[in-house]
């Protein structure tokens, strides 16, 4: 499956929107840094099938969408930027869903890569728990925004590696 050229442009736009969502100086939030235990092994160059990588990427973007579409995120972040962000993520999800269906078929894909998908879900659960514990403070959102920018960048790198292997 070939992801369209617009897909990588959308990735870049999503990263730019995340950067623009900054509300306060991150220098004041150092004490709130937290280890979310990003599931790096799911994004490393191990010899997994392309379909598995696409499933993991899809889950990553779906969970990002879920995280940023809560009422708490709407209250904390710029709504115009959030709306644009949702559009970009939605397009990413559509592209990846088309790919998943082409690669493995719709029935088997969710079950085949359950462990990888579960690792991504647990990662986002840790992020949500952190935000809850920090009472969705400005600094907590700043830390999470930085974390999502990093994980999003790693997702983009995985997509680039998939493309180069074609």
């Amino acid at each position: 499956c070939d992801l369209p050229q617009t897909h990588s442009l959308g990735n870049r736009r999503a990263l730019i929107l995340l950067a623009q969502m900054r509300r306060i100086s991150p220098f004041s939030c150092l004490k709130d840094r937290h280890d979310f235990e990003f599931p790096q092994e799911e994004f490393d160059d191990k010899q997994f099938q392309k379909a598995q990588a696409i499933s993991v990427l899809h889950e990553m973007i779906q969970q990002t969408f879920n995280l940023f579409s809560t009422k708490d995120s709407s209250a904390a972040l710029d709504e115009t930027l959030l709306d644009e962000f949702y559009i970009e993520l939605d397009q990413q999800l559509n592209d990846l869903e088309s790919c998943v269906m082409q690669e493995v078929g719709v029935i088997e894909s969710p079950l085949m890569y359950e462990d990888s998908i579960l690792a991504v879900r647990k990662y986002f659960q840790r992020i949500t728990l952190y935000l809850t514990e920090k009472k969705y403070s400005s600094c907590a959102w700043e830390v999470v925004r930085a974390e999502i920018m990093r994980s999003f960048s790693l997702s983009i790198n995985l997509q680039k590696r998939l493309k180069s292997k074609e």
């Epitope: 991150p26 004041s28 939030c29 150092l30 004490k31 840094r33 937290h34 280890d35 830390v143 960048s153």
Partner: antibody
């Protein structure tokens, strides 16, 4: 391979201006902050300030606020430290180092080789 | 600003010795503490971050512990290449501050 390469040694006279550089390579330059550290001859490490190259937001140690200016040009992956009027007491080795910002990763894991600044009449 | 105090300021030890350096913060810094090694004419090198996490490529004879205000760097068996100056640095708040350094010399 991650590298921070600093500009060469400088010999200046008191009152002169100076801008030294730190060029990053082998990583996404805007994903890390760049900090500057001073080490006077035979002395310890002193943190001067930091910049987020993604938007050039800066923070300074009170001891260096107003004495130096930190800047960055993300288009060429380079951070700068500058003085408008050097003093003899600015004679030191200056290091740049990268910092992961708010991400959970090792702080100041890569350092430049240092730039020796000598200010003498 | 948070003050960082290291002790001792210097120590003499032999190859194979167990060496302990302590660092005290003027207020709680949780576990936001880093340790660096510096050799003459060289840039500092990160050894330990977040109080006890060993930086990639650093020998396992180096270890860090502590939280709050009191921290320790331990070299379990001193090697010839370990003779250097060691600095702690708090990373919880700006301005970041370093300890004054501990010079480890050959006995």
């Amino acid at each position: 391979e991650v590298q921070l390469v600093q500009s060469g040694a400088e010999v200046k006279k008191p009152g002169e201006s100076l801008k030294i550089s730190c060029k990053g390579s082998g990583y996404s330059f805007t994903s890390y902050w760049i900090g500057w550290v001073r080490q006077m001859p035979g002395k310890g490490l002193e943190w001067m300030g930091i910049i987020d190259p993604s938007d050039s937001d800066t923070a300074y140690s009170p001891s260096f606020q107003g004495q130096v200016t930190i800047s960055a040009d993300k288009s060429i992956s380079t951070a700068y430290l500058q003085w408008s009027s050097l003093k003899a007491s600015d004679t030191a080795m200056y290091y740049c180092a990268r910092h992961p910002g708010l991400n959970w990763a090792p702080d100041f894991d890569y350092w430049g080789q240092g730039t020796l600044v000598t200010v003498s009449s | 600003d948070i003050q960082m105090t290291q002790s001792p300021s210097s120590l003499s030890a032999s190859v194979g010795d167990r060496v302990t350096i302590t660092c005290r913060a003027s207020q709680s810094i949780n576990r936001f503490l880093n340790w660096y090694q510096q050799k003459p004419g060289k840039a500092p090198k990160l050894l330990i971050y977040a109080a006890s996490s060993l930086q990639s490529g650093v020998p396992s004879r180096f270890s860090g512990s502590g939280s709050g205000t009191d921290f320790t760097l331990t070299i379990s068996s001193l090697q010839p290449e370990d003779f250097a100056t060691y600095y702690c640095q708090q990373a919880i708040d700006l301005p970041f501050t370093f300890g004054q350094g501990t010079k480890v010399e050959i006995k």
